[in-house]
């Protein structure tokens, strides 16, 4: 069974998948469509790296540009380093600038919805 066939079989169970499962799935060459990706739990999507999302979505990663104003895409973009976003070739903006340090202050982030940044 190839990655795409596997994805079709598990698609209906993905809504509540935790981050660890999504990371594992990104190694399976599944090419998740964007509509399915956007139904995932926001808290499960946010920790994924650019490389992991690229592997998870495959060719459909191109659609992030078209959906950049909608959650969870918008929130995920804000968590990524701009340098990493640039590798997607989509002109996505709003990532963390080069030289900034991301502090994982869970309480602050829960309140503000965005990561805490320390400047260079």
């Amino acid at each position: 069974m190839n990655g795409s066939e596997y994805f079709v079989k598990i698609q209906s169970f993905l809504g509540g998948a935790p981050t660890e499962d999504l990371k594992a799935l990104s190694q399976q060459n599944v090419s998740m469509d964007l509509a399915t990706f956007m139904k995932l739990r926001t808290d499960a999507v946010l920790p994924l790296t650019v490389a992991e999302v690229q592997k998870l979505l495959g060719p459909h990663v191109e659609g992030l540009k078209a959906e950049e104003r909608h959650r969870p895409v918008r929130d995920w973009i804000l968590r990524q380093r701009q340098d990493d976003l640039d590798t997607l070739g989509l002109g996505l903006q709003g990532g963390i600038p080069n030289g900034y340090l991301v502090l994982d202050l869970s309480m602050q982030e829960a309140l503000s919805g965005t990561p805490c940044l320390l400047g260079p």
């Epitope: 469509d33 964007l34 495959g58 191109e62 659609g63 540009k65 959650r71 590798t87 070739g89 989509l90």
Partner: antibody, heavy 117, light 113 residues
Framework: EVQLVQSGAEVKKPGASVKVSCKAS????????MHWVRQAPGQGLEWMGN????????YYNERFMSRVTMTVDKSTSTAYMELSSLRSEDTAVYYC??????????WGQGTLVTVSS | DIVMTQSPDSLAVSLGERATINCKSS????????????LAWYQQKPGQSPKLLIY???TRESGVPDRFSGSGSGTDFTLTISSLQAEDVAVYYC?????????FGGGTKVEIK
């Protein structure tokens, strides 16, 4: 003004390969994916695949998976599509098309590839 | 693969009259989160490259005359030319960009009656 200028018409023998170029101008080349679509004479449109010009990652329609290679040269803002093991049914106009998000916002003028013995 | 079925194959309409083209997909093209339908319409005039008219099923591309409109959601979509002009003679294609391989409808040829 966005422009996609493709290479000229080609005549190839069965079993040969063809490489079509698409030179982009009028926009930041690495900010938009490039797609390739073909159209056989008098027929409809068929999506062949797409490529991320920033990373060079490419994705192909499984119908062409073993025969197609898409590449880019960032220094010249040019995309390439190479199709190998040509057969008569590959005779078609090949288009490059720049993505607008997912849809195909700008198209090249097309390159006619004729496969004939 | 998602199958796109267009109807009719050809259409002859008098100048100034309405032309309606239908497109049906074999599965939904709706993103239920963003409410965007991943469907585009293209116009191909004789001897020319295709040109984008509509994306997200109903959003008109800039520069496209407002006599062109798109509607529909899920699996059923329509392209309408409200008042046909001579320069609208072309083949019109729908395309899904929901899941690869991105597929096109077979095309609808619009002619003047």
């Amino acid at each position: 003004e966005v422009q996609l200028v493709q290479s000229g018409a080609e005549v190839k023998k069965p079993g040969a390969s063809v490489k079509v170029s698409c030179k982009a101008s009028g926009y930041t080349f690495t900010n938009y994916w490039m797609h390739w679509v073909r159209q056989a004479p008098g027929q409809g449109l068929e999506w062949m695949g797409n490529i991320n010009p920033s990373s060079g990652d490419s994705y192909y329609n499984e119908r062409f998976m073993s025969r197609v290679t898409m590449t880019v040269d960032k220094s010249t803002s040019t995309a390439y599509m190479e199709l190998s093991s040509l057969r008569s049914e590959d005779t078609a106009v090949y288009y490059c098309a720049r993505s607008g998000g997912l849809w195909l916002a700008f198209w090249g003028q097309g390159t006619l590839v004729t496969v004939s013995s | 693969d998602i199958v796109m079925t267009q109807s009719p194959d050809s259409l002859a309409v008098s100048l100034g009259e309405r032309a309606t083209i239908n497109c049906k997909s074999s599965q939904t093209l709706l993103n239920s989160v963003s409410q965007n339908n991943y469907l585009a319409w293209y116009q191909q005039k004789p001897g020319q490259s295709p040109k984008l008219l509509i994306y997200f099923a109903s959003t008109r591309e800039s520069g496209v005359p407002d006599r062109f409109s798109g509607s529909g959601s899920g699996t059923d979509f329509t392209l309408t030319i409200s008042s046909l002009q001579a320069e609208d003679v072309a083949v019109y294609y729908c395309q899904q960009h929901y899941r690869t391989p991105y597929t096109f409808g077979g095309g609808t040829k619009v002619e003047i009656k």
